[in-house]
Interface confidence: low
């Protein structure tokens, strides 16, 4: 059984040409983390994997940073970088655990943060 | 295009080591790692290991911990895989493989293949 | 360590025919499977990953199915070129990687 739970940053939002760092956080749970994949809709951005480390995709390298620790900096913001992002914790013995977050990319300087909030 | 060329056959003593060397080229050498498989003569595919060349960290299969070190050297783009106390259940072709991180940690390029053969 | 068991562990088939391969988890491994081809002499070849993506360069004949602990690798409709020694390999366990024990596909 699955008992672990998801924290992320939930909903946030930052300035066009800014930096926002993504964060998920699993809890409750024993499993070991043996990867973290980081992707927005379909695509992937990055790998953080327990033995080999991280892995930014290529056409990602330039504007994505591995961390602080399992979380992804995202960099030179742009109004396209606004949508979907998901973590996804590889656990064993329990499988999979996802957390999304909602990033909107604001043209203007209004840019709050949102609540945090959890995925079971 | 990604190439990993592997050092050329080896015939050892029982007890003796040996250590096969895999250069790596066509991908930046420390964004992947390097998995190490083989194959006794008529037999399937036997996982040995893998090391990160991002960052070192090795992982060895449980029955050959503690006769087999893996090394990179990021300089030259090069993987090594020493065993060392060779005995004749050894003799097998030992291939270098890259873990590719879009393929689920599928070994997307291999080595041409290194014949060890382990005999008195 | 997670084990997996492919069957059948050989099969004759004729140009042309459908064949299917399939692979066995002892414990779920979501779709964290691999196929591979290797013919004599040379070394494995990844033709799927993630259980059914098809590797880039692998022709369309072939195909991945399966999630959890039962896995397929289909040939729609083999070719000469497809005589081989087929594996699977689960990347679920990063810790021990493990294959299957291999099908031998040969020509009727």
């Known amino acids: 059984m699955m008992t672990g739970t998801i924290e992320t940053t939930g909903n946030i939002s930052a300035e066009k040409g800014g930096s926002i760092i993504l964060q998920c956080h699993l809890s409750s749970t024993t499993a070991q983390v043996t990867q973290v994949n980081w992707e927005q809709q379909d695509q992937l951005l990055a790998i953080c994997n327990a033995d080999l480390g991280w892995h930014i995709s290529p056409s990602f390298k330039d504007r994505v940073a591995p961390g602080p620790g399992l979380g992804l900096t995202l960099q030179s913001l742009t109004v396209n970088d606004t949508g979907e992002y998901f973590c996804i914790y590889h656990t064993y013995p329990d499988g999979t655990y996802t957390g999304r977050i909602f990033l909107e990319v604001l043209e203007s300087s209004v840019a709050e943060h949102g609540a945090r909030f959890q995925i079971p | 295009q990604v190439q990993l060329v592997q050092s050329g056959a080896e015939v050892k003593k029982p007890g003796a080591s040996v250590k096969v060397s895999c250069k790596a080229s066509?991908?930046?050498?420390?964004?992947?790692?390097i998995s190490w498989v083989r194959q006794a003569p008529g037999q399937g595919l036997e996982w040995m290991g893998w090391?990160?060349?991002?960052?070192?960290?090795?992982n060895y299969a449980q029955k050959l911990q503690g006769r087999v070190t893996m090394t990179t050297d990021t300089s030259t783009s090069t993987a090594y895989m020493e065993l060392r106390s060779l005995r004749s259940d050894d003799t097998a072709v030992y291939y270098c493989?890259?873990?590719?991180?879009?393929?689920?940690?599928?070994?997307?390029?291999w080595g041409q293949g290194t014949l060890v053969t382990v005999s008195s | 360590a997670i084990q997996l068991t492919q069957s059948p562990s050989s099969l004759s088939a004729s140009v042309g025919d459908r064949v299917t391969i399939t692979c066995r988890a002892s414990?779920?491994?979501?779709?964290?499977l691999n196929w591979y081809q290797q013919k004599p002499g040379k070394a494995p070849k990844l033709l799927i990953y993630?259980?059914?993506s098809l590797q880039s360069g692998v022709p369309s004949r072939f195909s991945g199915s399966g999630s959890g602990t039962d896995f397929t690798l289909t040939i729609s409709s083999l070719q000469p070129e497809d005589f081989a020694t087929y594996y699977c390999?689960?990347?679920?366990?990063?810790?021990?990687?493990?294959f299957g024990q291999g099908t031998r596909l040969e020509i009727k």
């Open positions: 493989a890259r873990a590719g991180w879009e393929q689920q940690l599928g070994f997307d390029y």
């Open positions: 066509g991908y930046t050498f420390t964004s992947y790692g």
């Open positions: 090391i990160s060349a991002y960052n070192g960290n090795t």
């Open positions: 414990q779920s491994i979501s779709s964290y």
């Open positions: 993630a259980a059914s």
């Open positions: 390999q689960q990347s679920y366990s990063t810790l021990a990687i493990t």
